[in-house]
């Protein structure tokens, strides 16, 4: 196959029985009803056709039922994220049934074998759900399957095979290898539940993508573009883990999806919002901060059900740790004249001053290039709630910070040695808050002074018209 981990094997080769030795007493797929937050507590094991454990362990037929489905494992034991997720679900939904699907014997295999086992595990879950449906008061609509990595596709199979439609599937960074571009019934897909929401945290367009890149749900959320997660760089990992390795970076980014979901359960008062956008680059430009027509949503557990005709790709920025919430701002800067720009793009920074707090100095990422006589849009985000914005400081960085810029400046000087001062003219900055959907225009403090040059700053204050409100719904108003 031209790509690593190319799906191999034929329909007739798949025996649909566990790869683990058939002499084992322990079944290959076990359903562990967690009756306590304590990971040491054994809970109860449920099996199809045996009603006694349901009674003994007070299975609540009318409550929500969560099935947590792990993925491929190198260790063969439950990882710490699973216990955190169980605990968070118990905290948030006190009456709910939390079932851990233990398919460790089938997941602790070569990756390709574990992939080939996903169908049989999904089928086992579907059989359990079909059996539970025979009980009075049990409703598939109350079932929420939460699958991590390979477990997300297991959840997809379960939703596919069950008689009826499960309420919700959440895919936490669904596995990429052997699923990228797979048939709709061979991976998690929107058809597998009434609502399928997905978090993608380890996608790569180069090299091997551990998480699936393509959208597979009704809403697919790509925090930080779905690739490089803050706090997961090699430096961060080396700092926090003795002998940190690339493996730890992979784990950090892939597992970040789980922690974002846990965050949405335990930090309900600090919800993170994602915004619909066609791609990551447009989001980085700040173009996509609208909440009109269901274009924004809470991420994780609090996500509002959306069943669009077409899949919805959504983006957001996050902090490096819990709570992950940040505050997004769209900044529209109209550059109405340009002087002696040369080859090199300016490096701008902004500082936002608000009624609650002031931001740090924030870089304006130039995704393409600064256009003159045009409105240039940027995305900035802050970790703290600034409150209502009062003023903005725009700074044009002076001495070049990179060797590349220094070289370009040197070349620019050689071609135009008497290059007079570079200058931009900016009269106003329009700001829109993603979280409140409020729009505000800032004007230069001195209407006569609108020029900015390297090493200089320009101050903007709220224009006289104050906050301009549009008929756009604020995501915070719509919290469940």
């Amino acid at each position: 196959s031209p790509v690593p981990f190319g799906p191999e094997g034929r329909l007739e080769d798949k025996l649909h029985k566990p790869k683990a030795t058939q002499t084992e007493v322990k079944p290959s797929v076990r359903f562990n009803l967690r009756t306590s937050k304590d990971p040491e507590h054994e809970g109860c094991y449920l099996s199809v056709g045996h009603s006694q454990p349901l009674e003994d362990c007070s299975f609540n037929m009318t409550a929500k039922t969560f099935f947590i489905i792990h993925g491929w494992t190198m260790s063969g034991i439950f990882e710490n994220w699973l216990h955190k997720l169980v605990s968070a679900l118990h905290t948030r939904e006190k009456d709910a049934n939390v079932v851990v699907v233990d398919w460790l014997p089938l997941a602790h295999q070569l990756y390709t074998d574990a992939v080939n086992n996903t169908r049989v595990v999904g089928h086992s879950i579907a059989r359990m759900l079909d059996w539970l449906q025979e009980k009075d008061d049990f409703s598939l609509g109350n079932v929420h399957l939460i699958g991590y990595s390979l477990g997300a596709h297991v959840a997809g199979y379960a939703g596919n095979f069950v008689k009826g439609t499960v309420g919700r599937i959440t895919g936490l960074d669904p596995a990429g290898p052997m699923f990228e571009g797979a048939d709709i019934h061979k991976r998690l897909s929107p058809d597998d539940a009434d609502f399928v929401d997905v978090l993608h945290t380890y996608t790569r367009s180069f090299g091997l993508s551990i998480g699936i890149q393509m959208p597979v749900g009704h809403i697919d959320i790509y925090p930080n573009g779905g690739d490089f997660q803050p706090g997961c760089g090699l430096n961060d990992v080396l700092g926090s883990i003795a002998y940190g390795t690339i493996t730890e970076v992979v784990k950090c980014e892939h597992e970040r999806a789980v922690h974002l979901f846990v965050d949405s359960l335990v930090n309900q008062d600090k919800p993170s919002f994602a915004f619909q956008c066609t791609d990551s680059n447009r989001f980085k430009k700040g173009i996509c901060l609208s909440c009109r027509k269901n274009r924004c949503n809470s991420i994780g557990y609090n996500a509002k059900k959306m069943r669009n005709k077409r899949n919805s790709k959504m983006y957001l920025k996050t902090r490096a740790g819990m709570p992950f919430r940040v505050y997004h701002y769209q900044m529209k800067i109209h550059v109405f004249s340009y002087k002696n720009m040369g080859e090199i793009e300016p490096t701008f920074y902004v500082t936002l001053y608000g009624t609650n707090a002031d931001s740090q100095t924030l870089p304006l990422e130039i995704v393409e290039r600064i256009e003159q006589n045009a409105t240039n849009t940027f995305l900035v985000y802050t970790e703290e709630d600034l409150g209502d914005l009062l003023k903005i400081q725009l700074t044009w960085e002076g001495a070049s910070q990179s060797w590349y810029n220094l070289w370009k400046e040197f070349r620019s000087y050689l071609s135009q040695p008497r290059n007079p001062g570079r200058e931009l003219n900016i009269r106003r900055i329009r700001v829109k808050s993603g979280e409140t959907q409020r729009k505000l225009t800032f004007c230069t403090e001195d209407p006569e002074n609108t020029s900015i040059s390297p090493g200089r700053e320009l101050w903007f204050r709220k224009c006289r018209d104050g906050w301009r409100m549009k008929n756009e719904t604020s995501p915070t108003v719509e919290l469940p």
Epitope: L11, A126, A182, M214
Partner: antibody, heavy 116, light 107 residues
Framework: QVQLVQSGAEVKKPGASVKVSCKAS????????IAWVRQAPGQGLEWMGE????????KYNKKFKGRVTMTRDTSTSTVYMELSSLRSEDTAVYYC?????????WGQGTTVTVSS | DIQMTQSPSSLSASVGDRVSITCKAS??????VAWYQQKPGKSPKLLIY???YRFTGVPSRFTGSGAGTDFTFTISSLQPEDFATYYC?????????FGGGTKVEIK
């Protein structure tokens, strides 16, 4: 090995119904979707819909909704496709195909002729 | 529904020639595309799935590439048994849709 064996050719009058069968063997019948695809003379392939035998879930092409019904009999590992209110443009070869990586295996086809 | 536009609708080539067929999707289907071969009076056969993976037993002269909306199917050195009609199909979403087909004829 995987095999899909379809029922024989049919000649029907406009307005009638036809029911084509597809008997599967060589794999776990209940857990793979079986699609129906038709091909009018000299034309391309057209997906009509599919059924998952285990749960009897179906997906239909809206072009045929209301006219097509897909069913299954798990005891005989057979799926059926019934098309009603036949018209001359329904004259085609009807194929069943089992889906895994794609439409991995196909039946031999059943010719349905609609003629008055 | 996603439309799949295949081109050319027919082509003439000789044994040993390199042949390429393209398929364009009306919206992003990522790499969820399959290619089939159909000979007159026979059922279609799966050759390529997930845009670039060869199905079991398919000779290496058949290759697929592409992602997003543009896909290519190539036969590196045409053999006498390869004269047939080829179809692309998207398997990203329901309803599944096929391209119109490309008939590869002997020059």
């Amino acid at each position: 090995q995987v095999q899909l064996v379809q029922s024989g050719a049919e000649v029907k009058k406009p307005g009638a119904s036809v029911k084509v069968s597809c008997k599967a063997s060589g794999y776990t019948f209940t857990t793979y979707w079986i699609a129906w695809v038709r091909q009018a003379p000299g034309q391309g392939l057209e997906w009509m819909g599919e059924i998952l035998p285990g749960s009897a879930k179906t997906k239909y092409n809206k072009k045929f909704k209301g006219r097509v019904t897909m069913t299954r009999d798990t005891s005989t590992s057979t799926v059926y496709m019934e098309l009603s209110s036949l018209r001359s443009e329904d004259t085609a070869v009807y194929y069943c195909a089992v889906y895994d990586y794609g439409a991995d295996y196909w039946g031999q086809g059943t010719t349905v002729t609609v003629s008055s | 529904d996603i439309q799949m536009t295949q081109s050319p609708s027919s082509l003439s080539a000789s044994v040993g020639d390199r042949v390429s067929i393209t398929c364009k999707a009306s919206q992003d289907v990522y790499t969820a595309v399959a290619w089939y071969q159909q000979k007159p009076g026979k059922s279609p056969k799966l050759l390529i799935y997930s845009a670039s993976y060869r199905f079991t037993g398919v000779p290496s002269r058949f290759t697929g590439s592409g992602a997003g909306t543009d896909f290519t199917f190539t036969i590196s050195s045409l053999q006498p048994e390869d004269f047939a009609t080829y179809y692309c199909q998207q398997h990203y979403s329901i309803p599944r849709t096929f391209g119109g087909g490309t008939k590869v004829e002997i020059k």
